[in-house]
Interface confidence: low
């Protein structure tokens, strides 16, 4: 025969209020026999929850019909839940006794408990762009949740974050809490493909934490670096200068030349390449008429790269028959 | 007797997404968490994620389906779903549905969508 | 993840004759509260996979009394006392501790 076993799946039954709870209890023997009552609690001071002989139990149900003789489903619910209802509930066999029945069993208990998800974890980060070196401050909000116990992390890159400060309201009691978190991440030059993460984990989210995530890419401001030079190859009368603009980011650049202090409208030629580390390189390539008669020529690159204060580069052609070294100097 | 039916095979093309339904009756719904298994041809049982309806939309998935799996359940019509999103041709499999208490034990299954992914 | 391991992979059995099948957890599934979250699936050829025991040694309403399961912590057993030819499919174990739930390989169970 095999021994009775009390089977109480849940270890924790998360209800809402007003919502039915079903506390499932299963049995593996009808023996021995007796009844099955269900408590709230341990000890002398346990409270009877049901007792399917005598007793009166309005927002109590049975999920079967205990009056079956091979019944071995002892599973109940709870109608209209309310914050009273919480606590740990046995179902417990009894076995037959004189003068009264004589407990025999009790099941591992599942703990009641009002609880509700927080909500998936919202970060948002600085109003505006930050170079790199720089402290900015990502916002991470969560709503909606309850028991209050609330675990929050910080994550940059997948790398746990410890400069942050967190707070759950209201901090009495209540139906149900928010977390708000405001964490501090200095800014690298190659952060523009990393990310941070907000981490929430809860004790209905059974081991799963949610995550809200925002991309450094939208906070930082990587600004470029400018080299102008005049390609060794003279074609005729024409020199071929070009300017590189290196690690900038975002994409958003304007680039204009400038002749002697006149700015060109003719077409150059121009490429746009992406880095590994996300951020982009412009390269821009000019065309200048020369002749053995003309003054020397000051080429200018300008770059105004994301609505910034425009950085510029300059090089002095210095043209004669026999073309000469070139020079280049910068301006701030 | 709970028992969970899913809907009809379907056949997808790569790049796209699939729904599959689970609509359970004789039992009670919400309480219960509804998980989804899936089963490759010839090979075994594998976890894609649940939801207990009770305790809203918020579902556990399977780290390798995160992100391309989606799992609802609508209490109204006591039906649970599942998205998976960027089908490529290894997603062609028998997909289940499973009734369990709690995340645990699942006591009750579905008769599986065969999704077959092909160009 | 739990990672379970079923043995063997295929199990040629004689009707009447008594068969066994094997499963390890690579952690302990014994709960607090006492009872192993290890559970036994019998996935009929052609069929969805039915519960055939639960939290270890416990018998599935409706599943007949030839199947038990026994084990502790992380060594489990299936044992099926006569099998039958009904009984051929693939057995699967599942530890129902924590997500994700994780599933045995299986184990090919065919009439010789």
């Known amino acids: 025969e095999e021994e009775l076993q009390m089977i109480q799946p849940e270890k924790l039954l998360l209800v809402t209020v007003g919502k039915t709870a079903t506390l499932h209890c299963t049995v593996t023997s009808l023996l021995p026999v007796g009844p099955v009552l269900w408590f709230r609690g341990v000890g002398p001071g346990r409270e009877l929850i049901y007792n399917q002989k005598e007793g009166h139990f309005p927002r109590v149900t049975t999920v079967s019909d205990l009056t079956k003789r091979n019944n071995m489903d002892f599973s109940i619910r709870i109608s209209s839940i309310t914050p009273a209802d919480v606590g740990t509930y046995y179902c417990v066999k009894f076995r037959k006794g004189s003068p009264e029945n004589v407990e025999f069993k009790s099941g591992p208990g599942t703990e009641m408990a009002l609880g509700a998800k927080p909500s998936a974890p919202v970060v948002l980060g600085p109003a505006a762009r930050t170079t790199p070196e720089h402290t900015v401050s990502f916002t991470c909000e969560s709503h909606g949740f309850s028991p209050r116990d609330i675990t929050l992390k910080w994550f940059k890159n997948g790398n746990e974050l410890s400069d942050f400060q967190t707070n759950v309201d209201p901090t009495g009691q209540s139906v149900a809490y928010s977390i708000r978190s405001t964490a501090r991440v200095v800014l690298d030059p190659w952060d523009v493909r990393s990310q941070v993460i907000c981490e929430v984990a809860h004790v209905t989210l059974q081991g799963d934490p949610l995550r809200g995530t925002a991309n450094l890419s939208e906070a930082i401001r990587v600004p470029p670096t400018l080299e102008v030079t005049q390609q060794p190859m003279r074609v005729g009368n024409q020199v071929n200068v070009t300017c590189q603009v290196r690690k900038f980011y975002p994409q958003s650049l304007q680039l204009t030349w400038s002749e002697n202090g006149n700015v060109c409208q003719r077409e150059t030629a121009s490429t746009l390449t992406e880095n590994k580390d996300g951020t982009y390189n412009w390269t821009s390539w000019f065309l200048v008429n020369i002749s053995d008669q003309r003054d020397d020529v000051v080429l200018t690159c300008q770059v105004k790269h994301d609505g910034q204060l425009a950085v510029s580069k300059r090089l002095a052609l210095e043209v004669t028959v026999h073309q000469k070294d070139q020079s280049s100097d910068a301006t701030p | 007797q709970v028992q969970l039916v899913q809907s009809g095979a379907e056949v997808k093309k790569p790049g796209s997404s699939v729904k599959v339904s689970c609509k359970a009756s004789?039992?009670?719904?919400?309480?219960?968490?509804i998980s989804w298994v899936r089963q490759a041809p010839g090979q075994g049982l594998e976890w894609m994620g649940g939801?207990?309806?009770?305790?809203?939309?918020?579902?556990s998935y399977a780290q390798k389906f995160q992100g391309r799996v989606t799992i609802t359940a609508d209490e109204s019509t006591s039906t649970a779903y599942m998205e998976l999103s960027s089908l490529r041709s290894e997603d062609t499999a028998v997909y289940y549905c499973?009734?369990?208490?709690?995340?645990?034990?699942?006591?009750?299954w579905g008769q599986g969508t065969l999704v077959t992914v092909s160009s | 993840d739990i990672v379970m391991t079923q043995s063997p992979l295929s199990l040629p059995v004689t009707p009447g004759e008594p068969a066994s099948i094997s499963c390890r957890s690579s952690q302990s599934l014994l709960h607090s509260n006492g009872y192993n979250y290890l559970d036994w699936y019998l996935q009929k050829p052609g069929q969805s996979p039915q519960l055939l025991i639960y939290?270890?040694?416990s018998l599935q309403s409706g599943v007949p009394d030839r199947f038990s399961g026994s084990g502790s912590g992380t060594d489990f057993t299936l044992k099926i006392s006569r099998v039958e030819a009904e009984d051929v499919g693939v057995y699967y174990c599942m530890q129902a501790l924590q997500t994700p739930l994780t599933f045995g390989g299986g184990t090919k169970v065919e009439i010789k």
């Open positions: 004789g039992g009670t719904f919400s309480n219960y968490a």
């Open positions: 939290a270890a040694s």
């Open positions: 499973a009734r369990g208490v709690g995340d645990d034990t699942l006591t009750d």
């Open positions: 939801i207990i309806p009770i305790f809203g939309s918020t579902a």
